[in-house]
Interface confidence: low
């Protein structure tokens, strides 16, 4: 079950607990997490992570017991950890991952917890002993049972089945806001000296919150949102409001680089490196942060803040959230990802921007692109309109800008001349007594995927040229062949003549020159990320996935790619998992990514695989994966034995029993079989696929995977009274493929 940092489950406990057998398996990357609370008016049992260590607090009547794991073993490493806490006959024992961590005597009184069990968080429970407890769990509870019964059922709508992908997402995975009430909360955004917030935004939302940070003083905040398709930033301080708009449209479904920069003197928002900033009025001063940095949505308190604000910042959208995604998020220069979030609501790992709706456009016919770019640019308020001074010649009567800009069209990887039609003057230069050589262009920001090449001595270094150079075809754009269909140059244009003219022309005007890239279909090709040799154990199967081979095609999505296995189909070792025995001569890139394919070795020398991949228009050259089958070697890694009280049960965990094989990047099936009769007990396996609360059954065989999932245990069934410790010798054999290791 997945808990997102603000959720919990409650389980009623109507009677006192005399014995406790609590088993939890959890994983989290957060150093703080409340795992479980059994709550009564005074009696309680609390299990929490604090600074990455597991702490157990048991209060029975007047007695208090505390147990904790060692400081050097941090459990906030995103790896599943199994915790077993037993309280039986006045003795409490805590073990983590099969190792005994602590034990202590406890009073024999039953635990009176009529308020029930709280799993993953305490909800609205307000009890004095809960002060200072950890935050609610953000992570997964893979299993939670008390005295053999599941604590994870029924799930409430905000606690999800399984373990969410977002908990293991690295910070290069986008934050996907799937709405309508999406939200990600991160540690507070401090802006004492200066604060920066940077991300790449992809959305079609015309109104949506992007970032909110409350201040320590009531009513102070920083708020960034999309307002009517453009970025807006608001800083509210005791002494007034600073409001800033950026004129670059962002609600076009394209990625935009966003940067928000704040210090005591000014606020700046920049979209695709086009900045807007306040003058250095010094009104901002320092905003002491309070609470979390909210991204993509607002919580109830933030909504209230904004609704109460005199500017009426959120007319109808206080509960709306961003529909789209943020990539490459960094806060004050530190990368942040879903894993660092304190809580999330309705989030997805990765950018799945309304895929269904736009898939056809994204990979459709290339002709479609020629109509996209020109329509995307006119909304840009560049340059800033120029207001001519009074008394200028009549030619400047209705003057606002010197040039009319038209997009430059270039083929992917090709070149295009910058021509007069791209930068056409709005007035008659002769009448204004201006020469083409006096209209000076300087490149203030180059294109992301190409270079403006100037065939003029010394100009390339200065990045400057004139309108006369344009007419003489001295400036051409060379595209680098990348796949983006649009780009832009930022040009500053000034006039160097000494004739009467608006002062803005002397200072210079900034223009955006859109560049539209017409795509070219590139053929796909096959790459082997770990080399073109694959090792498999004899008589086993190995998954074929992107870690073995993959297609690289810069202009086709995975959906459009198909692999073919070349050679005779009879005896072909590639199969779909769900169609064993049936050769897979052709399969899709999606199937490969989904892990649907396996290489099956049935004996003899392994067969090499030769593939090619096609995007429907062009196919790659064939590529061969060499396959070597090796004989399984099995080695005992751990066989520690168990120590348990007569009549009790103890899980057999990897710390007690595990083997290693010579498999390379292959998750092989390791089978243990009991070869001798047991005298004092029985080996049991949990039925029904490891469901919490499922029954335990006597078994003669189990897999290493069962051990890893805590589904195997030894149950002492010997009723006789012994004056000495009895020893059960468990004789096992291990099988991998057709290789057997006996007398384990």
């Amino acid at each position: 079950a997945s808990f997102f940092g603000e959720n919990h489950l409650e389980v009623p406990v109507a009677t006192a607990l005399t014995d406790i057998d609590l088993q939890l398996q959890f994983s989290t990357s957060q150093p703080e997490a409340l795992l479980l609370l059994a709550a009564g008016p005074a009696d309680h049992l609390l299990l929490q992570l604090y600074s990455g260590r597991l702490q157990v607090r048991l209060v029975l009547g007047q007695e208090e017991l505390r147990l904790q794991t060692p400081a050097e073993t941090l459990l906030s490493d995103s790896i599943p950890h199994t915790v077993v806490l037993t309280v039986v006959e006045g003795w409490a024992t805590l073990s983590v991952d099969g190792f005994l961590n602590a034990s202590s005597a406890v009073p024999g009184a039953p635990l009176e917890v009529p308020y029930g069990l709280f799993v993953g968080g305490t909800g609205t429970l307000g009890l004095p002993y809960l002060r200072g407890t950890s935050r609610p769990l953000r992570g997964c509870l893979h299993a939670a049972t008390l005295n053999g019964r599941s604590l994870l059922r029924p799930l409430t709508p905000d606690v999800h089945e399984g373990c969410a992908e977002e908990f293991s997402a690295s910070d290069d995975v986008a934050l996907g806001f799937s709405g309508p009430h999406s939200l990600a909360a991160f540690p507070a955004w401090g802006t004492q000296d200066e604060g920066t917030l940077e991300f790449t935004l992809t959305t079609q939302s015309r109104q949506a919150p992007l970032a909110f940070q409350a201040g320590g003083r009531r009513g102070d905040f920083i708020y960034v949102d999309i307002f009517e398709g453009h970025l807006r930033a608001v800083v509210e301080k005791g002494q007034g409001t600073v409001l800033l708009h950026n004129s670059v449209p962002v609600a076009d479904g394209q990625p935009h680089e966003v940067s928000v920069h704040i210090n005591a003197h000014r606020l700046e928002i920049s979209v695709d490196q086009y900045p807007t900033h306040t003058s250095n009025r010094g009104v901002l001063s320092y905003l002491e942060p309070r609470g979390s940095l909210l991204l993509g949505g607002l919580d109830a308190e933030a909504s209230r803040h904004l609704q109460e604000h005199r500017l009426g910042l959120t007319p109808e959208a206080t509960n709306a959230s961003l529909l789209g995604c943020m990539e490459d998020l960094s806060v004050n220069g530190q990368r942040r990802g879903l894993r660092e979030a304190l809580l999330t609501r309705n989030m997805a790992a990765g950018c799945r921007l309304e895929e269904e709706e736009y898939e056809d456009d994204a990979y459709g016919h290339y002709e479609a692109f020629s109509t996209l770019a020109p329509e995307a640019w006119p909304a840009m308020e560049l340059p800033e309109p120029c207001v001519p001074e009074p008394g200028l010649p009549p030619v400047f009567a209705n003057f606002t800008q010197l040039l009319t800009i038209s997009p430059l069209v270039v083929a992917e990887g090709g070149t295009a001349w910058l021509e007069w039609r791209h930068v056409q003057p709005t007035l008659d230069l002769m009448e204004a007594e201006l020469r083409k050589s006096q209209v000076l262009f300087s490149v203030t920001r180059g294109a992301r995927h190409g270079e403006l090449e100037l065939d003029i001595p010394g100009a390339q270094a200065r990045k400057m040229f004139t309108l006369l150079d344009v007419v003489n075809r001295k400036a051409r754009f060379i595209h680098d062949g990348s796949e983006d269909t649009s780009d832009q140059l930022v040009l500053e244009v000034s006039v160097t003549a000494r004739v009467p003219m608006p002062s803005c022309l002397r200072r210079g005007q900034t223009y955006l020159l859109p560049i539209q890239v017409n795509p070219v279909n590139d053929p796909p090709h096959i790459i082997f990320p770990h080399g073109s040799l694959m090792v498999i154990l004899e008589h086993t199967q190995k998954p074929l996935g992107p870690e073995v081979f993959q297609a690289y095609d810069p202009d086709s999505a995975c959906e459009g790619l198909t692999f073919q296995v070349l050679g005779t189909s009879s005896g072909l070792p590639v199969e779909r998992r769900d169609q064993p025995g049936e050769p897979a001569t052709e399969f899709s890139c999606r199937e490969l990514e989904a892990g649907s394919l396996v290489y099956v070795h049935r004996g003899g020398p392994a067969q090499d695989l030769t593939f090619r991949v096609s995007d429907g228009l062009q196919a790659s050259p064939p590529a061969t994966l060499k396959v070597v089958a090796i004989r399984p070697a099995i080695q005992i890694h751990r066989s520690t034995g168990l120590r348990l009280a007569q009549g009790s049960a103890m899980p057999i965990l990897p710390a007690n029993l595990s083997v290693e094989t010579n498999a390379v990047g292959q998750d092989v099936s390791v089978l243990f079989r009991v070869t001798g009769a047991l005298q004092f007990g029985e080996l049991q396996k949990q039925g029904a696929g490891g469901v919490e609360g499922a029954e335990w059954w006597a078994t003669q065989a189990f897999h290493q995977r069962d051990v890893e999932q805590g589904r195997v245990r030894y149950l002492s069934t010997d009723p006789q009274h012994h004056a000495y410790d009895t020893v059960e010798n468990l004789a096992l054999e291990v099988q991998v493929g057709q290789e057997i290791l006996s007398n384990l």
Partner: antibody, heavy 122, light 107 residues
Framework: EVQVEVSGGGLVQPGGSMRLSCAVS????????MNWVRQSPEKGLEWIAE??????????YYAESVKGRFTISRDNSKNSLYLQMISLRAEDTAIYYC?????????????WGQGTLLTVSS | DIVMTQSQDSMATSVGERVTVNCKAS??????VAWYQQKPGQSPEPLLF???YRYTGVPDRFSGSGSGTDFTLTISSVQAEDVAEYFC?????????FGQGTKLEIK
């Protein structure tokens, strides 16, 4: 011995209101999550509402079919559970049972009252 | 919502016979299923919880099995007093839902 007595059923017109009560003895009422479940020939058994403990701020959960029309409440001092129903419809006609949840092993119903019949008809 | 479907609306058997009542969930509910018995004119009473655990005082001729989506209530040797309607219920997720019931009659 556990006893669960339900009262308050009867005939009511569509659009009307009704309050059902449930008195409990024989177990510590304040420690149990309580529910209303109804049964009709058309829909069979149907869970409709749950109320938790004082320590849970008396959190309430409802089935979609009754959300906004029915309100579950409890009075621990009187060992009583209530169901206030407004905007009643013909499809609310059923026998209404007051039930409690089993002890921490899961959300199954272990104590059932004898039920009271509510008929919504003009 | 999770739909619980009991394959037979009614079944007739003889005293001493073994009988099984089936229940299918529309999605995985692990073992979070309870069974109830409702005798004519009475309230339902719990028989089993967690798919296979007998409720206090329930005779051991009643047993249950299953996990995931398929569940079975078995009466190993039917007695005259077992004439009743039997319901399954899932408590894997809200809303909690019941099967439509299976009536057991004696021939």
């Amino acid at each position: 011995e556990v006893q669960v007595e339900v009262s308050g059923g009867g005939l009511v017109q569509p659009g009307g209101s009704m309050r059902l009560s449930c008195a409990v003895s024989g177990f510590t009422f304040s420690n149990y999550w309580m529910n209303w479940v109804r049964q009709s020939p058309e829909k069979g058994l149907e869970w409709i509402a749950e109320i938790r403990l004082k320590s849970n701020n008396f959190a309430r959960y409802y089935a979609e079919s009754v959300k906004g029309r029915f309100t579950i409440s409890r009075d621990n001092s009187k060992n009583s559970l209530y169901l206030q129903m407004i905007s009643l419809r013909a499809e609310d006609t059923a026998i209404y049972y007051c039930t409690s949840y089993g002890n921490y092993v899961g959300h199954y119903f272990d104590h059932w009252g004898q039920g009271t019949l509510l008929t919504v008809s003009s | 919502d999770i739909v619980m479907t009991q394959s037979q609306d009614s079944m007739a058997t003889s005293v001493g016979e073994r009988v099984t009542v089936n229940c299918k969930a529309s999605q995985n509910v692990d073992t979070n299923v309870a069974w109830y018995q409702q005798k004519p004119g009475q309230s339902p009473e719990p028989l089993l919880f967690s798919a296979s655990y007998r409720y206090t005082g329930v005779p051991d001729r009643f047993s249950g099995s299953g996990s995931g989506t398929d569940f079975t209530l078995t009466i190993s040797s039917v007695q005259a007093e077992d004439v009743a309607e039997y319901f399954c219920q899932q408590y894997n997720s809200y809303p909690l839902t019941f099967g439509q019931g299976t009536k057991l009659e004696i021939k």
